[in-house]
Structure formats: structure tokens, C-alpha cells
């Protein structure tokens, strides 16, 4: 069915991290081009990536308008050089994506330990509050701004001389942990949204260890 010499897109897949959101699909076009439309449940379809030979479309600008809405995208196929052509139903051949709710589904990007500071037997570990592409009042919001208390960080820490890990959790971007005086520790953090059903955890941050550049030490 559909327009002669065009095939419908398939394997429509959302790829999203910290709200940077790209729709990918197959196949690589042969004598055809694609246009993407995206809508919330309002059915107000907006066209993007007009007549492209790419098999991906950056939809970030649309989904960041309201990350708690649920979105659907559809990919239209047109014969190259004849984009006015329509299918047997009087419209171009198209396929729908799965539904996508950014707030519930965007992957949490790998966090970064911004700094750690030791004061006596306490260490303050600070996680970088990553900027997202979500805007409010013309300023970009951080991950914490968007998720608020829904987002927690888990800290994994261990003595450099052993492998036994301890954990701590925070609803802010800072940890204050007790350490043994005179011991060096290593740290790694993970972003977590406990209320989620999918994509609950980020990958672990790179490991940072005391005695390296990011640390500050005070007696």
C-alpha cells in the first residue's frame, strides 16, 4: 500500500539523554525522503526535518516545551523529487513512533563529581548540576531544576586501600560523609529517579580519588 516506490519507516526509536531527544528510524532512504511530525495528545501536529535523507530528527526543541507531556511522532515517506505524491489513502505513507514522555523516560546522563573537600574526618562531595536544554524564562534549567526532589544521587565510596564500598544518598547535589582520618578514599556517583519504572539510574560517574586534583584538604 502507499505511494509507488516508497517504503514506510520502521523501527522508530526515541534516543534521549537529559532531554536531548532524537528520533531514529530505518531504512536508509533509496529514492525517497522523509518528513517528521510530532504532537502531544492535543493532535496539533508540527512538521520537522522536512524532506530529509537522514534517518534521525532532533526533536529536542519540541519536547522541552513541556517535558511532562506525552509525545508521539510520525515519519512520512515521499518519493525523492516528487514530494507532492500521496498514497492510496490520499495521504503520504507514514508510520507512528511509540509514545514518549520525556520526564519519565529520558535517560539520566552520566554525572560528574565537581569537587570534594575534606575537613577533618568529614568529606563534602559535590555533584555537578548538569544543564539541560529545558528552558524557563529564557534560561536553561539544570537537571535538579527540572526533577526537583524526584532526583536523588547515590554516592559510592571506598578506601583506596580496600574494595569494600559504602553508599550514601542525597536529595541535593551534595554529600557529607564520615571518613577515617589519614585514609584516602575514592568516589563515584549515580543519578537515580526512584519513582520511575524505566531508566531509573544513570551510569556511574568517573571515579575520583582523594590525593588527586579535584580535592581540597583542610585540617
Amino acid at each position: 500500500s502507499g505511494t509507488t516506490n516508497t517504503v514506510a519507516a520502521y523501527n522508530l526509536t526515541w534516543k534521549s539523554t537529559n532531554f536531548k531527544t532524537i528520533l531514529e528510524w530505518e531504512p536508509k532512504p533509496v529514492n525517497q525522503v522523509y518528513t517528521v511530525q510530532i504532537s502531544t495528545k492535543s493532535g496539533d501536529w508540527k512538521s520537522k526535518c522536512f524532506y530529509t535523507t537522514d534517518t534521525e530528527c532532533d526533536l529536542t526543541d519540541e519536547i522541552v516545551k513541556d517535558v511532562k507531556q506525552t509525545y508521539l511522532a510520525r515519519v512520512f515517506s515521499y518519493p525523492a523529487g516528487n514530494v507532492e505524491s500521496t498514497g492510496s489513502a490520499g495521504e503520504p505513507l507514514y508510520e507512528n513512533s511509540p509514545e514518549f514522555t520525556p520526564y519519565l523516560e529520558t535517560n539520566l546522563g552520566q554525572p560528574t563529581i565537581q569537587s570534594f573537600e575534606q575537613v577533618g574526618t568529614k568529606v563534602n562531595v559535590t555533584v555537578e548540576d548538569e544543564r539541560t536544554l529545558v528552558r524557563r524564562n529564557n534560561t536553561f534549567l539544570s537537571l535538579r531544576d527540572v526533577f526537583g526532589k524526584d532526583l536523588i544521587y547515590t554516592l559510592y565510596y571506598w578506601k583506596s586501600s580496600s574494595s569494600g564500598k559504602k553508599t550514601a544518598k542525597t536529595h541535593t547535589n551534595e554529600f557529607l560523609i564520615d571518613v577515617d582520618k589519614g585514609e584516602n578514599y575514592c568516589f563515584s556517583v549515580q543519578a537515580v529517579i526512584p519513582s520511575r519504572k524505566v531508566n531509573r539510574k544513570s551510569t556511574d560517574s568517573p571515579v575520583e580519588c582523594m590525593g588527586q586534583e579535584k580535592g581540597e584538604f583542610r585540617e
Epitope: G43, E91, E95
Partner: antibody, heavy 118, light 106 residues
Framework: EVQLLESGGGLVQPGGSLRLSCAAS????????MGWVRQAPGKGLEWVST????????YYADSVKGRFTISRDNSKNTLYLQMNSLRAEDTAVYYC???????????WGKGTTVTVSS | DIQMTQSPSTLSASVGDRVTITCRAS??????LAWYQQKPGKAPKLLIY???SLESGVPSRFSGSGSGTEFTLTISSLQPDDFATYYC????????FGGGTKVEIK
């Protein structure tokens, strides 16, 4: 609770006009496409028209195109169907429905009856 | 327009029976199909969307399957409340309904 309540049905002569209304409550009206579906006596369901949340996109079945106009007033949470040049075959129960993406109908009103007869 | 054909048009069954209703599309509609239940004098009620996704609050004895042109609605164990007319609806290209299947008491 999500509710849809149709009104405006009645008896009208062939060639006449009617305006149906559908009052919505229990959800953010402008966030959803809405539609009208009708059912002639003893018959199956027939899609009539759909409108997007902003009102910017409208779709019609061929059987009503040029005669019926769908519209909405988001400030009043109300959907409308203006029916002109009515025919005997337009006689039906008219249902208003909430229609995510304009695709399927997840909440329906109880319906209002339109009878076109001389 | 895409035509939707339901079979059978009438089905006689008993409480506890496994019931299957078929819906065929005149061309491929992928998984863009919904199922509704309607009782006499009442509005239709959404049961299934996207061919197999169960609408919130619908009993798990209802299930949908299929893709492309052939779809089925299955009621695993028919209950007294399930005697009604069932409609399929495609939403791949505009909207069209099947003619309905009436499930009546044997």
C-alpha cells in the same frame, strides 16, 4: 472524574441546521484532540469529525464534508458541531469523545439524538 | 479509505467461554487499532488501543493481538457483564470502524 456531556440534539427538517455542544470537565481540555462519532438507529459507529487541541487542525468524514463544521472554545471547555443542510441519513445519536492525538477515543459522552425528518 | 471487516457479526456464547472476535483491515494499519465495547442505549467504552494495550481499568480477561491487517480481541472467560457489541477501529489513516460483533447469550 473525566466527563463529557452533549446537548443540542432534537428534531429538524431536511435542509435545516443544528448546533451540538459538548461540555467537558475533569481534564485539561486544550491538551486533547476531540471528536464526534455518530450511530444511526440499529447501525454501527461512524466517525464524523476531529479537531486538534488548539483548534488549528480539523478533519471530516466525506459524508459530512462541506456541511458540518467542528470547533471548540477552550476557555469554556466546550466542543461544538455545527450541522447544516441536514439530511435524513444524518439521523443518529451523536457522541462527543476525547481523542488522544486524534487517533482513538478514550472517553465518550452519553450522546445526544438528532432526528432529521419532515 | 481503509475498510474494516469484523467477523462474526453475531456470536453466541456462554459464561466462562473463551471468545475471539476478528477484525481485518483492507490494507496494513500496523498496530494502529482500537477495540470498544458498547451496551444497548449506552456510549461505547474503550477496551484496547494500539492493538494490544489494555486501557486503564479494563479487566485483564480482555486482550488484543495482531498487526498489519489481521487483529483479534479475546475474552479469556466470558462474564455476564461482557454480553455486548464490540467494535474495532483503525486510526492509521483517518478513522474507520468495523461493523460490530454482537456477543449474545447462547
Amino acid at each position: 472524574e473525566v466527563q463529557l456531556l452533549e446537548s443540542g440534539g432534537g428534531l429538524v427538517q431536511p435542509g435545516g441546521s443544528l448546533r451540538l455542544s459538548c461540555a467537558a470537565s475533569g481534564f485539561t481540555f486544550s491538551d486533547y484532540a476531540m471528536g464526534w462519532v455518530r450511530q444511526a438507529p440499529g447501525k454501527g459507529l461512524e466517525w464524523v469529525s476531529t479537531i486538534s487541541g488548539s483548534g488549528g487542525l480539523t478533519y471530516y468524514a466525506d459524508s459530512v464534508k462541506g456541511r458540518f463544521t467542528i470547533s471548540r472554545d477552550n476557555s469554556k471547555n466546550t466542543l461544538y458541531l455545527q450541522m447544516n443542510s441536514l439530511r435524513a441519513e444524518d439521523t443518529a445519536v451523536y457522541y462527543c469523545a476525547k481523542a488522544p492525538y486524534g487517533y482513538y477515543m478514550d472517553v465518550w459522552g452519553k450522546g445526544t439524538t438528532v432526528t432529521v425528518s419532515s | 479509505d481503509i475498510q474494516m471487516t469484523q467477523s462474526p457479526s453475531t456470536l453466541s456464547a456462554s459464561v466462562g467461554d473463551r471468545v475471539t472476535i476478528t477484525c481485518r483491515a483492507s490494507q496494513s494499519i500496523s498496530s494502529w487499532l482500537a477495540w470498544y465495547q458498547q451496551k444497548p442505549g449506552k456510549a461505547p467504552k474503550l477496551l484496547i488501543y494500539k492493538a494490544s494495550s489494555l486501557e486503564s481499568g479494563v479487566p485483564s480477561r480482555f486482550s488484543g493481538s495482531g498487526s498489519g491487517t489481521e487483529f483479534t480481541l479475546t475474552i479469556s472467560s466470558l462474564q455476564p457483564d461482557d454480553f455486548a457489541t464490540y467494535y474495532c477501529q483503525q486510526y492509521k489513516s483517518y478513522i474507520t470502524f468495523g461493523g460490530g460483533t454482537k456477543v449474545e447469550i447462547k
